[in-house]
Protein backbone atom coordinates (compact mmCIF):
# COMPACT_ATOMS: atom_id res chain seq x y z
CA UNK A 1 0.00 0.00 0.00
CA UNK A 2 1.43 3.38 -0.94
CA UNK A 3 0.68 6.34 1.25
CA UNK A 4 -1.20 9.50 0.59
CA UNK A 5 0.51 12.54 2.07
CA UNK A 6 -1.80 15.43 2.74
CA UNK A 7 0.36 18.26 1.38
CA UNK A 8 -0.52 20.14 -1.78
CA UNK A 9 2.69 20.09 -3.69
CA UNK A 10 2.35 21.34 -7.22
CA UNK A 11 6.09 21.50 -7.63
CA UNK A 12 7.05 17.96 -6.78
CA UNK A 13 3.97 15.90 -6.15
CA UNK A 14 4.82 12.47 -4.81
CA UNK A 15 1.79 10.96 -6.52
CA UNK A 16 0.11 13.17 -9.13
CA UNK A 17 -3.58 12.36 -9.10
CA UNK A 18 -3.68 10.75 -12.50
CA UNK A 19 -1.20 8.09 -11.40
CA UNK A 20 -2.50 7.23 -7.94
CA UNK A 21 -4.50 4.04 -7.77
CA UNK A 22 -7.64 3.97 -5.69
CA UNK A 23 -6.95 2.48 -2.30
CA UNK A 24 -3.42 3.83 -2.00
CA UNK A 25 -2.30 6.29 0.67
CA UNK A 26 -0.75 9.72 0.27
CA UNK A 27 0.58 12.66 2.22
CA UNK A 28 -2.05 15.32 2.59
CA UNK A 29 -0.27 18.27 1.01
CA UNK A 30 -1.69 20.13 -1.96
CA UNK A 31 -1.41 22.96 -4.48
CA UNK A 32 -4.39 25.11 -3.72
CA UNK A 33 -4.98 28.76 -4.39
CA UNK A 34 -4.72 30.91 -7.44
CA UNK A 35 -2.53 28.44 -9.29
CA UNK A 36 -4.01 25.11 -8.27
CA UNK A 37 -3.87 22.48 -10.98
CA UNK A 38 -7.21 20.95 -11.78
CA UNK A 39 -5.75 17.45 -11.64
CA UNK A 40 -3.85 17.80 -8.38
CA UNK A 41 -5.72 15.79 -5.79
CA UNK A 42 -3.46 16.54 -2.94
CA UNK A 43 -5.46 18.63 -0.39
CA UNK A 44 -8.74 18.92 1.56
CA UNK A 45 -11.30 18.61 4.39
CA UNK A 46 -14.13 16.36 3.14
CA UNK A 47 -17.70 16.94 4.33
CA UNK A 48 -16.73 19.62 6.80
CA UNK A 49 -18.24 23.09 6.96
CA UNK A 50 -17.05 26.68 6.96
CA UNK A 51 -15.28 27.47 10.22
CA UNK A 52 -16.77 30.32 12.19
CA UNK A 53 -14.60 33.39 11.74
CA UNK A 54 -11.99 34.08 14.42
CA UNK A 55 -12.33 30.59 15.92
CA UNK A 56 -9.01 29.20 14.61
CA UNK A 57 -6.55 32.02 15.28
CA UNK A 58 -3.65 29.55 15.42
CA UNK A 59 -4.30 28.27 11.87
CA UNK A 60 -1.56 29.21 9.42
CA UNK A 61 -1.20 28.76 5.68
CA UNK A 62 2.13 27.90 4.08
CA UNK A 63 2.35 29.48 0.65
CA UNK A 64 4.53 28.98 -2.39
CA UNK A 65 4.78 32.05 -4.58
CA UNK A 66 2.76 33.76 -5.81
CA UNK A 67 -0.13 32.60 -3.60
CA UNK A 68 -0.30 28.84 -3.76
CA UNK A 69 -1.26 27.23 -0.49
CA UNK A 70 0.52 23.89 -0.15
CA UNK A 71 0.17 23.04 3.55
CA UNK A 72 -1.39 24.14 6.79
CA UNK A 73 0.49 24.91 9.99
CA UNK A 74 -0.23 25.86 13.60
CA UNK A 75 0.99 28.77 15.70
CA UNK A 76 2.29 27.32 18.98
CA UNK A 77 4.41 30.25 20.21
CA UNK A 78 4.57 33.95 19.30
CA UNK A 79 7.40 33.21 16.85
CA UNK A 80 7.03 29.50 16.06
CA UNK A 81 4.78 27.27 13.98
CA UNK A 82 4.35 23.53 13.94
CA UNK A 83 3.63 21.73 10.69
CA UNK A 84 4.25 18.33 9.11
CA UNK A 85 7.87 17.52 8.22
CA UNK A 86 6.73 16.40 4.78
CA UNK A 87 5.65 20.02 4.16
CA UNK A 88 9.25 21.28 4.24
CA UNK A 89 10.21 23.65 1.44
CA UNK A 90 13.21 25.93 1.27
CA UNK A 91 11.31 29.02 0.10
CA UNK A 92 7.79 29.72 1.35
CA UNK A 93 5.71 32.37 3.04
CA UNK A 94 3.44 32.15 6.07
CA UNK A 95 -0.01 33.69 6.29
CA UNK A 96 -1.84 34.00 9.61
CA UNK A 97 -5.19 35.57 10.50
CA UNK A 98 -6.66 34.88 7.07
CA UNK A 99 -10.04 33.21 6.61
CA UNK A 100 -10.46 32.85 2.86
CA UNK A 101 -8.25 30.77 0.60
CA UNK A 102 -7.91 33.51 -2.01
CA UNK A 103 -5.08 36.01 -1.56
CA UNK A 104 -7.47 38.95 -1.19
CA UNK A 105 -6.34 41.20 1.66
CA UNK A 106 -8.07 40.70 5.01
CA UNK A 107 -7.69 43.22 7.80
CA UNK A 108 -6.67 40.60 10.36
CA UNK A 109 -3.97 38.97 8.28
CA UNK A 110 -0.29 38.92 9.18
CA UNK A 111 2.39 37.77 6.72
CA UNK A 112 5.74 36.25 7.65
CA UNK A 113 8.84 34.59 6.30
CA UNK A 114 10.16 31.39 7.77
CA UNK A 115 13.76 32.00 8.84
CA UNK A 116 14.43 28.47 10.05
CA UNK A 117 12.69 25.16 9.50
CA UNK A 118 13.64 22.31 11.81
CA UNK A 119 12.18 18.91 10.93
CA UNK A 120 12.13 16.27 13.63
CA UNK A 121 15.41 14.38 13.19
CA UNK A 122 13.54 11.08 13.26
CA UNK A 123 11.42 11.89 10.21
CA UNK A 124 12.27 9.89 7.11
CA UNK A 125 10.94 10.83 3.67
CA UNK A 126 8.71 9.37 2.29
CA UNK A 127 7.65 7.68 5.55
CA UNK A 128 5.28 9.07 8.15
CA UNK A 129 6.82 8.51 11.57
CA UNK A 130 7.80 11.68 13.47
CA UNK A 131 6.05 13.82 10.86
CA UNK A 132 6.49 17.22 12.45
CA UNK A 133 8.62 20.30 11.95
CA UNK A 134 9.09 23.62 13.70
CA UNK A 135 9.24 26.85 11.70
CA UNK A 136 10.70 30.01 13.19
CA UNK A 137 9.07 33.21 11.92
CA UNK A 138 11.11 36.28 10.99
CA UNK A 139 9.43 38.22 13.79
CA UNK A 140 6.97 37.69 16.62
CA UNK A 141 3.27 37.82 15.83
CA UNK A 142 1.09 40.69 16.95
CA UNK A 143 -1.54 38.94 19.09
CA UNK A 144 -5.09 39.76 17.99
CA UNK A 145 -8.46 38.01 17.86
CA UNK A 146 -7.35 36.55 14.52
CA UNK A 147 -3.78 35.53 15.42
CA UNK A 148 -2.77 33.79 18.63
CA UNK A 149 -0.96 30.61 19.62
CA UNK A 150 -2.42 27.38 20.97
CA UNK A 151 -0.86 25.13 23.61
CA UNK A 152 0.38 21.69 22.61
CA UNK A 153 -1.24 18.93 24.65
CA UNK A 154 1.08 16.86 26.81
CA UNK A 155 -1.66 14.26 27.29
CA UNK A 156 -2.06 11.56 24.66
CA UNK A 157 -5.53 11.24 23.12
CA UNK A 158 -7.92 8.54 24.21
CA UNK A 159 -10.35 6.75 21.91
CA UNK A 160 -13.63 8.60 21.53
CA UNK A 161 -12.18 12.05 22.22
CA UNK A 162 -13.92 14.66 20.08
CA UNK A 163 -11.59 16.91 18.11
CA UNK A 164 -11.69 19.59 15.45
CA UNK A 165 -9.50 19.53 12.35
CA UNK A 166 -9.22 22.52 10.01
CA UNK A 167 -7.70 23.44 6.70
CA UNK A 168 -8.11 24.75 3.18
CA UNK A 169 -7.52 21.39 1.51
CA UNK A 170 -9.71 20.05 -1.25
CA UNK A 171 -13.31 19.31 -0.27
CA UNK A 172 -13.77 16.50 -2.80
CA UNK A 173 -11.76 13.37 -3.59
CA UNK A 174 -10.54 12.04 -5.95
CA UNK A 175 -11.76 15.16 -7.78
CA UNK A 176 -10.37 18.48 -6.62
CA UNK A 177 -12.45 21.33 -5.33
CA UNK A 178 -10.87 23.90 -3.08
CA UNK A 179 -13.03 25.76 -0.58
CA UNK A 180 -13.51 29.50 -0.50
CA UNK A 181 -12.89 29.72 3.24
CA UNK A 182 -11.28 27.71 6.04
CA UNK A 183 -13.04 24.41 6.63
CA UNK A 184 -13.68 22.82 10.02
CA UNK A 185 -14.59 19.24 10.77
CA UNK A 186 -15.45 17.40 13.98
CA UNK A 187 -13.80 14.00 14.21
CA UNK A 188 -13.33 11.38 16.91
CA UNK A 189 -10.07 9.76 17.96
CA UNK A 190 -10.03 6.03 17.21
CA UNK A 191 -8.37 3.34 19.28
CA UNK A 192 -4.82 2.46 18.29
CA UNK A 193 -6.06 -1.05 17.48
CA UNK A 194 -8.62 0.24 14.99
CA UNK A 195 -5.91 2.46 13.52
CA UNK A 196 -3.53 -0.47 13.11
CA UNK A 197 -6.30 -2.63 11.65
CA UNK A 198 -6.99 0.06 9.05
CA UNK A 199 -3.31 0.42 8.13
CA UNK A 200 -1.48 -2.81 9.02
CA UNK A 201 2.25 -2.40 9.76
CA UNK A 202 2.11 1.33 9.05
CA UNK A 203 1.13 2.80 12.42
CA UNK A 204 3.39 3.58 15.36
CA UNK A 205 3.02 5.61 18.53
CA UNK A 206 3.98 8.85 16.76
CA UNK A 207 0.60 8.67 14.96
CA UNK A 208 -3.06 8.43 15.84
CA UNK A 209 -6.16 7.93 13.72
CA UNK A 210 -9.34 9.95 13.77
CA UNK A 211 -12.47 10.12 11.67
CA UNK A 212 -16.09 9.10 11.66
CA UNK A 213 -18.45 6.77 9.81
CA UNK A 214 -20.08 9.48 7.75
CA UNK A 215 -17.32 10.05 5.21
CA UNK A 216 -15.68 12.95 6.92
CA UNK A 217 -11.94 13.31 6.64
CA UNK A 218 -9.00 15.61 6.14
CA UNK A 219 -7.24 15.43 2.80
CA UNK A 220 -4.44 16.86 0.68
CA UNK A 221 -3.57 20.47 1.32
CA UNK A 222 -4.67 20.07 4.92
CA UNK A 223 -1.26 18.60 5.83
CA UNK A 224 0.43 20.18 8.81
CA UNK A 225 -2.82 21.73 10.01
CA UNK A 226 -4.23 21.45 13.53
CA UNK A 227 -6.23 18.76 15.29
CA UNK A 228 -7.58 20.46 18.41
CA UNK A 229 -9.04 18.40 21.24
CA UNK A 230 -10.34 19.88 24.51
CA UNK A 231 -8.87 23.27 23.67
CA UNK A 232 -5.30 22.17 23.03
CA UNK A 233 -3.31 21.00 20.02
CA UNK A 234 -3.33 17.22 19.90
CA UNK A 235 -2.19 16.46 16.37
CA UNK A 236 -1.16 17.58 12.91
CA UNK A 237 -2.71 16.40 9.67
CA UNK A 238 -0.24 13.89 8.25
CA UNK A 239 -1.49 11.20 5.87
CA UNK A 240 -4.32 8.89 4.95
CA UNK A 241 -5.95 6.80 2.28
CA UNK A 242 -6.56 7.88 -1.29
CA UNK A 243 -9.20 8.85 -2.17
CA UNK A 244 -9.83 10.53 1.17
CA UNK A 245 -12.90 9.83 3.32
CA UNK A 246 -13.14 6.14 2.43
CA UNK A 247 -14.99 3.86 4.86
CA UNK A 248 -12.71 2.26 7.46
CA UNK A 249 -9.77 4.34 6.24
CA UNK A 250 -9.43 7.13 8.81
CA UNK A 251 -7.10 10.09 8.61
CA UNK A 252 -3.73 9.66 10.31
CA UNK A 253 -2.33 12.44 12.47
CA UNK A 254 1.00 13.22 14.11
CA UNK A 255 0.66 12.39 17.81
CA UNK A 256 2.07 15.54 19.37
CA UNK A 257 1.93 14.36 22.99
CA UNK A 258 5.03 12.31 22.17
CA UNK A 259 6.97 15.39 21.15
CA UNK A 260 6.32 18.07 23.79
CA UNK A 261 9.88 17.82 25.14
CA UNK A 262 11.43 18.05 21.65
CA UNK A 263 9.21 21.02 20.78
CA UNK A 264 10.07 22.93 23.96
CA UNK A 265 13.79 22.19 23.79
CA UNK A 266 14.06 23.05 20.10
CA UNK A 267 12.28 26.37 20.52
CA UNK A 268 14.46 27.26 23.53
CA UNK A 269 17.67 26.28 21.75
CA UNK A 270 16.82 28.40 18.68
CA UNK A 271 15.25 31.48 20.25
Amino acid sequence: VTEHVLANNDVSCDHPSNTVPSGSNQDLGAGAGEDARSDDSSSRIINGSDCDMHTQPWQAALLLRPNQLYCGAVLVHPQWLLTAAHCRKKVFRVRLGHYSLSPVYESGQQMFQGVKSIPHPGYSHPGHSNDLMLIKLNRRIRPTKDVRPINVSSHCPSAGTKCLVSGWGTTKSPQVHFPKVLQCLNISVLSQKRCEDAYPRQIDDTMFCAGDKAGRDSCQGDSGGPVVCNGSLQGLVSWGDYPCARPNRPGVYTNLCKFTKWIQETIQANS
Partner: antibody, heavy 117, light 110 residues
Protein backbone atom coordinates in the same frame (compact mmCIF):
# COMPACT_ATOMS: atom_id res chain seq x y z
CA UNK B 1 16.15 28.95 -20.91
CA UNK B 2 17.08 28.68 -17.23
CA UNK B 3 20.68 29.84 -16.85
CA UNK B 4 23.22 31.09 -14.34
CA UNK B 5 26.43 32.87 -15.35
CA UNK B 6 29.17 33.89 -12.93
CA UNK B 7 31.49 36.76 -13.76
CA UNK B 8 34.20 38.80 -12.09
CA UNK B 9 37.95 39.36 -11.99
CA UNK B 10 40.02 36.22 -12.38
CA UNK B 11 42.87 37.62 -10.30
CA UNK B 12 42.68 39.24 -6.86
CA UNK B 13 45.56 40.48 -4.71
CA UNK B 14 46.08 39.05 -1.21
CA UNK B 15 44.20 41.02 1.48
CA UNK B 16 41.93 42.40 -1.24
CA UNK B 17 38.23 41.73 -1.83
CA UNK B 18 36.92 39.16 -4.26
CA UNK B 19 33.74 40.33 -6.01
CA UNK B 20 31.61 38.11 -8.23
CA UNK B 21 28.19 38.35 -9.78
CA UNK B 22 25.82 35.66 -10.92
CA UNK B 23 23.45 36.67 -13.72
CA UNK B 24 20.11 34.86 -13.49
CA UNK B 25 17.86 34.24 -16.47
CA UNK B 26 14.82 32.09 -17.21
CA UNK B 27 13.31 32.10 -13.72
CA UNK B 28 12.29 34.64 -11.06
CA UNK B 29 14.72 35.05 -8.18
CA UNK B 30 11.72 35.81 -5.99
CA UNK B 31 10.79 32.09 -6.03
CA UNK B 32 14.11 30.47 -5.21
CA UNK B 33 16.97 30.36 -2.76
CA UNK B 34 20.42 30.74 -4.29
CA UNK B 35 23.72 29.29 -3.10
CA UNK B 36 27.37 30.10 -3.58
CA UNK B 37 29.75 27.14 -3.60
CA UNK B 38 33.49 27.07 -4.28
CA UNK B 39 36.05 24.43 -5.20
CA UNK B 40 39.77 24.92 -4.64
CA UNK B 41 41.93 23.32 -7.38
CA UNK B 42 41.99 19.54 -6.99
CA UNK B 43 39.77 19.64 -3.91
CA UNK B 44 36.12 19.12 -3.02
CA UNK B 45 33.08 21.39 -2.94
CA UNK B 46 32.77 23.98 -0.17
CA UNK B 47 29.47 25.67 0.68
CA UNK B 48 29.80 29.44 1.16
CA UNK B 49 26.24 30.56 1.82
CA UNK B 50 22.60 30.84 0.78
CA UNK B 51 20.37 33.83 0.10
CA UNK B 52 16.58 33.63 0.21
CA UNK B 53 14.03 35.82 -1.59
CA UNK B 54 13.23 37.44 1.75
CA UNK B 55 16.91 38.53 1.91
CA UNK B 56 17.57 36.14 4.77
CA UNK B 57 21.15 34.92 4.39
CA UNK B 58 22.92 31.88 5.84
CA UNK B 59 26.70 31.77 5.79
CA UNK B 60 29.14 28.94 6.41
CA UNK B 61 30.72 29.43 9.83
CA UNK B 62 34.15 30.03 8.25
CA UNK B 63 32.71 32.75 6.02
CA UNK B 64 30.93 34.86 8.65
CA UNK B 65 32.44 38.32 8.81
CA UNK B 66 34.30 37.87 5.52
CA UNK B 67 31.47 37.13 3.11
CA UNK B 68 28.55 39.23 1.89
CA UNK B 69 25.88 37.77 -0.39
CA UNK B 70 23.24 40.05 -1.86
CA UNK B 71 20.70 40.41 -4.66
CA UNK B 72 20.69 43.53 -6.82
CA UNK B 73 17.68 45.82 -6.94
CA UNK B 74 16.60 44.55 -10.36
CA UNK B 75 16.42 41.01 -8.91
CA UNK B 76 18.41 39.59 -11.81
CA UNK B 77 21.82 39.20 -10.19
CA UNK B 78 23.22 37.62 -7.08
CA UNK B 79 26.57 38.90 -5.86
CA UNK B 80 29.31 37.53 -3.64
CA UNK B 81 31.97 39.56 -1.87
CA UNK B 82 34.78 37.88 0.06
CA UNK B 83 37.16 40.17 1.94
CA UNK B 84 40.71 39.75 3.25
CA UNK B 85 41.48 37.04 0.73
CA UNK B 86 44.53 34.79 0.88
CA UNK B 87 45.93 32.14 -1.45
CA UNK B 88 43.63 29.63 0.28
CA UNK B 89 40.66 31.40 -1.33
CA UNK B 90 41.88 30.50 -4.83
CA UNK B 91 39.06 28.38 -6.26
CA UNK B 92 36.40 27.96 -8.90
CA UNK B 93 33.34 29.83 -7.60
CA UNK B 94 29.85 28.60 -8.53
CA UNK B 95 26.40 30.01 -8.00
CA UNK B 96 23.52 27.54 -7.95
CA UNK B 97 19.75 27.49 -7.58
CA UNK B 98 17.96 25.40 -4.97
CA UNK B 99 15.03 23.38 -6.37
CA UNK B 100 13.03 24.21 -3.20
CA UNK B 101 13.53 20.65 -1.96
CA UNK B 102 17.10 21.18 -0.78
CA UNK B 103 18.86 20.13 -3.96
CA UNK B 104 20.93 22.46 -6.17
CA UNK B 105 19.40 21.79 -9.57
CA UNK B 106 20.86 24.58 -11.72
CA UNK B 107 24.54 25.57 -11.60
CA UNK B 108 26.59 28.23 -13.34
CA UNK B 109 29.62 27.13 -15.30
CA UNK B 110 31.90 28.45 -12.53
CA UNK B 111 34.60 31.08 -12.60
CA UNK B 112 38.19 30.59 -11.48
CA UNK B 113 39.50 33.23 -9.10
CA UNK B 114 43.21 33.21 -8.30
CA UNK B 115 44.55 35.09 -5.30
CA UNK B 116 48.09 36.16 -6.04
CA UNK B 117 50.26 39.26 -5.95
CA UNK C 1 28.34 20.78 14.19
CA UNK C 2 27.03 18.65 11.34
CA UNK C 3 29.79 17.00 9.34
CA UNK C 4 29.42 14.83 6.26
CA UNK C 5 31.85 11.97 5.71
CA UNK C 6 31.97 10.09 2.42
CA UNK C 7 33.53 6.72 1.81
CA UNK C 8 35.46 5.52 0.03
CA UNK C 9 37.35 8.61 -1.12
CA UNK C 10 38.04 6.78 -4.39
CA UNK C 11 37.22 3.47 -6.00
CA UNK C 12 38.04 1.60 -9.18
CA UNK C 13 35.31 -0.21 -11.05
CA UNK C 14 34.50 -1.64 -14.46
CA UNK C 15 31.63 -0.90 -16.83
CA UNK C 16 28.62 -2.96 -15.74
CA UNK C 17 29.67 -3.09 -12.08
CA UNK C 18 27.30 -2.22 -9.25
CA UNK C 19 28.83 0.68 -7.33
CA UNK C 20 27.90 1.83 -3.84
CA UNK C 21 29.05 5.08 -2.22
CA UNK C 22 28.19 5.93 1.38
CA UNK C 23 27.74 9.23 3.16
CA UNK C 24 27.55 9.53 6.92
CA UNK C 25 26.29 12.53 8.86
CA UNK C 26 27.67 13.26 12.33
CA UNK C 27 24.07 13.84 13.55
CA UNK C 28 20.68 12.92 12.13
CA UNK C 29 19.77 14.92 9.05
CA UNK C 30 16.51 13.03 8.57
CA UNK C 31 16.09 12.70 4.78
CA UNK C 32 17.59 16.00 3.68
CA UNK C 33 20.46 14.68 1.64
CA UNK C 34 21.35 15.34 -2.00
CA UNK C 35 23.86 13.62 -4.30
CA UNK C 36 25.81 15.29 -7.12
CA UNK C 37 28.00 14.08 -9.96
CA UNK C 38 30.91 16.19 -11.15
CA UNK C 39 33.13 15.60 -14.17
CA UNK C 40 36.51 17.33 -14.58
CA UNK C 41 36.20 20.99 -15.57
CA UNK C 42 32.41 20.93 -15.26
CA UNK C 43 29.88 22.14 -12.72
CA UNK C 44 28.27 19.55 -10.44
CA UNK C 45 24.99 17.97 -11.55
CA UNK C 46 22.15 17.12 -9.16
CA UNK C 47 21.37 13.39 -9.19
CA UNK C 48 19.19 12.77 -6.13
CA UNK C 49 17.50 14.91 -3.48
CA UNK C 50 15.48 14.08 -0.36
CA UNK C 51 17.79 11.05 -0.03
CA UNK C 52 15.96 8.98 -2.65
CA UNK C 53 14.17 11.23 -5.16
CA UNK C 54 15.71 11.09 -8.63
CA UNK C 55 16.30 14.52 -10.19
CA UNK C 56 14.79 15.25 -13.58
CA UNK C 57 16.59 13.56 -16.49
CA UNK C 58 18.78 11.34 -14.31
CA UNK C 59 18.97 7.70 -15.47
CA UNK C 60 17.21 5.13 -13.31
CA UNK C 61 20.44 3.20 -12.70
CA UNK C 62 21.14 5.82 -10.03
CA UNK C 63 19.33 5.38 -6.73
CA UNK C 64 19.63 6.78 -3.24
CA UNK C 65 18.62 5.37 0.11
CA UNK C 66 19.00 5.99 3.81
CA UNK C 67 17.80 8.34 6.52
CA UNK C 68 19.06 9.72 9.78
CA UNK C 69 22.85 9.47 9.61
CA UNK C 70 23.60 6.81 6.98
CA UNK C 71 23.01 7.23 3.27
CA UNK C 72 23.92 5.34 0.13
CA UNK C 73 24.20 6.21 -3.56
CA UNK C 74 24.03 3.16 -5.79
CA UNK C 75 24.80 2.89 -9.50
CA UNK C 76 23.24 -0.42 -10.51
CA UNK C 77 25.28 -0.92 -13.68
CA UNK C 78 28.16 1.47 -14.19
CA UNK C 79 28.28 3.13 -17.61
CA UNK C 80 31.31 4.80 -19.26
CA UNK C 81 29.81 8.24 -18.68
CA UNK C 82 29.48 7.56 -14.93
CA UNK C 83 33.21 7.82 -14.22
CA UNK C 84 33.26 11.03 -12.19
CA UNK C 85 33.43 12.38 -8.66
CA UNK C 86 30.30 12.13 -6.48
CA UNK C 87 29.40 14.42 -3.57
CA UNK C 88 26.71 14.29 -0.91
CA UNK C 89 25.24 17.43 0.66
CA UNK C 90 23.06 17.77 3.73
CA UNK C 91 20.15 20.20 3.71
CA UNK C 92 18.91 19.66 7.25
CA UNK C 93 20.48 22.78 8.73
CA UNK C 94 22.67 25.73 7.85
CA UNK C 95 23.28 26.74 11.48
CA UNK C 96 26.95 26.79 12.51
CA UNK C 97 27.98 24.70 9.52
CA UNK C 98 31.53 24.61 8.19
CA UNK C 99 30.56 22.72 5.03
CA UNK C 100 27.32 21.12 3.88
CA UNK C 101 29.15 18.85 1.41
CA UNK C 102 30.93 15.55 1.93
CA UNK C 103 34.52 15.19 0.80
CA UNK C 104 33.70 13.42 -2.46
CA UNK C 105 34.20 9.95 -3.95
CA UNK C 106 36.12 9.58 -7.19
CA UNK C 107 34.95 6.67 -9.36
CA UNK C 108 37.75 5.60 -11.69
CA UNK C 109 38.08 2.99 -14.43
CA UNK C 110 39.64 -0.26 -13.25
Amino acid sequence: EVQLQESGPGLVKPSGTLSLTCAVSGFPLSNYAMSWVRQPPGKGLEWIGDIYPSDIIDYASWAKGRVTISVDSSKTQVSLKLSSVTAADTAVYYCARDNNDYGLDIWGQGTLVTVSS
Amino acid sequence: AYQMTQSPSSLSASVGDRVTITCQASQSISSWLAWYQQKPGKAPKLLIYLASTLASGVPSRFSGSGSGTDFTLTISSLQPEDFATYYCQQGYTNSNIINTFGGGTKVEIK
